[in-house]
Each structure stands twice: as C-alpha cells, then as structure tokens.
Amino acid sequence: QGWQAFKNDATEIIPELGEYPEPPPELENNKTMNRAENGGRPPHHPFETKDVSEYSCRELHFTRYVTDGPCRSAKPVTELVCSGQCGPARLLPNAIGRGKWWRPSGPDFRCIPDRYRAQRVQLLCPGGEAPRARKVRLVASCKCKRLTRFHNQSELKDFGTEAARPQKGRKPRPRARSAKANQAELENAY
C-alpha cells in the first residue's frame, strides 16, 4: 500500500503503490523516449490459455517534467504509459513491428499499471524561491487485466498473481476522486 490514490491539481488519480523495482538509472537529460516494449511474461502454453501470465501489453516510455504550483522539476522524469490492447505475449513483439494486433474473441483485456516506483525530484521555482523537493510516484511496469462484460466498462477484473489494489484515497482515510488521464506534464505528480 502506501501510495494510494493521490489527487493532483489536474484531479488525476494515481493508484496506490504496491511492490516496486529498484530505483531507475540516472535519467537522460533532454531526451524524450517513446518506446514500445513487451511488458508481459514469456508464454509457455498455446495462446488460447486463459492465464493472464500469457498476455502482454505495450509499455511506452515518456520523459516529462513534474510541476508543482509554479515550480518545475530540474530534470524530466521517465515514466511508463501502459497502452494498447493485450494479446498473447508471443505475438506482441511481432504484431507491434508489423502493424498487426491480436484481437481476442472472448473477453477484452486492458493494459494497466502494475507496479510503481517512487522518485525524489528537485523542483525549481520562479522569483528566486529556494528549490523544493517532493517524491513522485511513477509507473514502473504494466500488466493485462480482463474487462468483464457483466460489469460497467470501467470495472477491470485482475487475473494477475498480485490482485490490483483498489483505487483508495491517500493513507488513513481512503477515498478516490475523479480521474483525468494522460496529461502532458505530471502536475504535482501525486
């Protein structure tokens, strides 16, 4: 738990943090990456399997600046955006390259954040204000979740080994607020 849904100035919901990997390597300055990667596990069975471990989705890497009020991070942070439809892991790398996409005949799968990492950022402020620091929570990996047809489109059913944590509020008094996705900068980043 820990980093539960934080409301930022753009009312974006960022889900709580579960386990997360080692801190990222030093960020590359002034370089924007938009790279699709295979975010899933390698397949061991035919792709008719209902095991979510056989599915994979795209992880797009973006660098962006974190803003907080009038302040902006000294360096951009690199984060993942989970994108695209899920398909069997063995097909995805080729499918991305050839412009094809596997479409399941059964339930829809969706690519969503799986793990998060925290990163300290130094914020530079205008008007001679002293720099300030905060910790931002960034997506570290993506996973596939199945969209059940019996529920509202926004409800996702998790087949992963780690159950998705509910979109709670911040720590002691959990509650979620409305979400606005994909803003260009991580406004307040939490």
Epitope: D9, G127, K135
Partner: antibody
C-alpha cells in the same frame, strides 16, 4: 492499513536525552519525507525538521539544531528523533509525519508525550 | 522566520453556518499554505495543501483560497464533526511555521 506507530510516553530527567521512534506500516518510508512536529501543552505546533530516509538528507529548523537529531532505518521502516540536554521547555507531544513533499505533512503518527522532570 | 497570524483565535458558530478562518503571512508565501484540523484530544490531520487542494477524503464543504500573504479556510454548512482547532502552515521557506490556531466551538 497505513499507520505511523510512535513509541510510548517518556518521563525523563532534566539534562538527559531521549530517543523517540516512529514505525510505518502499509508503506515504505523511503517513498516519503519523514517530518517531526512539536506541540506543547495548550500551545501551537512547531516544525522540527525532515529527513529523507532514502539517503539520510535532513533539514532542521534553526531552533532545533543541536537539540534534535533525526535518523531513519529503512530496514525496519522506522524514523527516529533524538532530543538531547532536555529541559522543561522540551515537555511536549512530538508527532512524526510522512509527507510526499518537504513542505506539508500528509499523515501523522499518534504522538509521543515527553515529560521532563527536574 | 515567516510569522503566520491566524484569526480569529476562537469562534462560536451554529450547525449549518458558513464560517471563515483567515491566515496572514508576514511575507509572500506564494501558494505554499496548508490547513490542518485537530479535533479535541486527537492528532492533527491535513485538510488542504497548496492553498486550495483538498486532501483525499476531506469533505467538499471545506475550501481554501488566497495567495501571497492572505489566505482563507471556509467551512460551509458546519457539521458537529467539524468542531476542532484549525491551524495554517506555510511551506514557503525554512523553518516552516504554523499559525496559532483557531478554536471552533458550537454556539
């Protein structure tokens, strides 16, 4: 459930030192700045300082430099506040806080009462 | 140090009232103002950060406004659970400082 659990009340002699602990559960203290705030009986709140448990960086209010020492142990997910050369002025409730930023305090522990006797 | 002057120091109001607490900083603190609520015998909790951002789980009857040196906390339609002492805090520069508190009581 996310909690900041602080150590129990302390009754200490004037001139002595005391070390307070604040153990986090439900989150990793490395992901936050850990702050300490003092509240004297029937008085307001005073910020003591913050520590970044990830690297040990600290910032103290000038008033508490030399009086307070903040440390953190990430393996036990615990932040500590040591107060030295205690006087009656140090009798207070001490709160630990977890903050996403250095400049406000998201979550508060239940407080530790320190009573300094002469 | 930046001083935070809170007024009034105490306030009596009736359920359903709209109440306003003000906080004045002795120098410009931009948007870096937070509000905390401390119920009797309890711990402080964050209500509002960065002038007007509600901490998650805080009811929408709480709102904050202001900039520079003058800031306001407004509680519309006062509820019994809002009886508490309210503190402002500046996060503009070290050392961070709190207002003296406003004790809100029921009439």
């Amino acid at each position: 459930e996310v909690q900041l659990q602080q150590s129990g009340a302390e009754l200490v002699r004037s001139g002595a030192s005391v070390k307070l602990s604040c153990t986090a559960s439900g989150f990793n203290i490395k992901d936050y700045f850990m702050h300490w705030v003092k509240q004297r009986p029937e008085q307001g709140l005073e910020w003591i300082g913050w520590i970044d448990p990830e690297n040990g960086d600290t910032e103290y209010a000038p008033k508490f430099q030399g009086k307070a020492t903040m440390t953190a142990d990430t393996s036990s997910n615990t932040a500590y506040l040591q107060l030295s050369s205690l006087t009656s002025e140090d009798t207070a409730v001490y709160y630990c806080n977890a903050g996403q930023a250095t400049y406000y305090f998201d979550y508060w522990g239940q407080g530790t009462t320190v009573t300094v006797s002469s | 140090d930046i001083q935070m002057n809170q007024s009034p120091s105490s306030l009596s109001a009736s359920l359903g009232d709209t109440i306003t607490i003000t906080c004045h900083a002795t120098q410009n603190i931009n948007v870096w103002l937070s509000w905390y609520q401390q119920k009797p015998g309890n711990i402080p909790t964050l209500l509002i950060y960065k002038t007007s951002n509600l901490h998650t789980g805080v009811p929408s009857r709480f709102s904050g406004s202001g900039s520079g040196t003058g800031f306001t906390l407004t509680i519309s339609s006062l509820q019994s659970e809002d009886i508490a002492t309210y503190y402002c805090q500046q996060g503009q520069s070290f050392p961070y400082t709190f207002g003296g508190g406003t004790k809100l009581e029921l009439k």
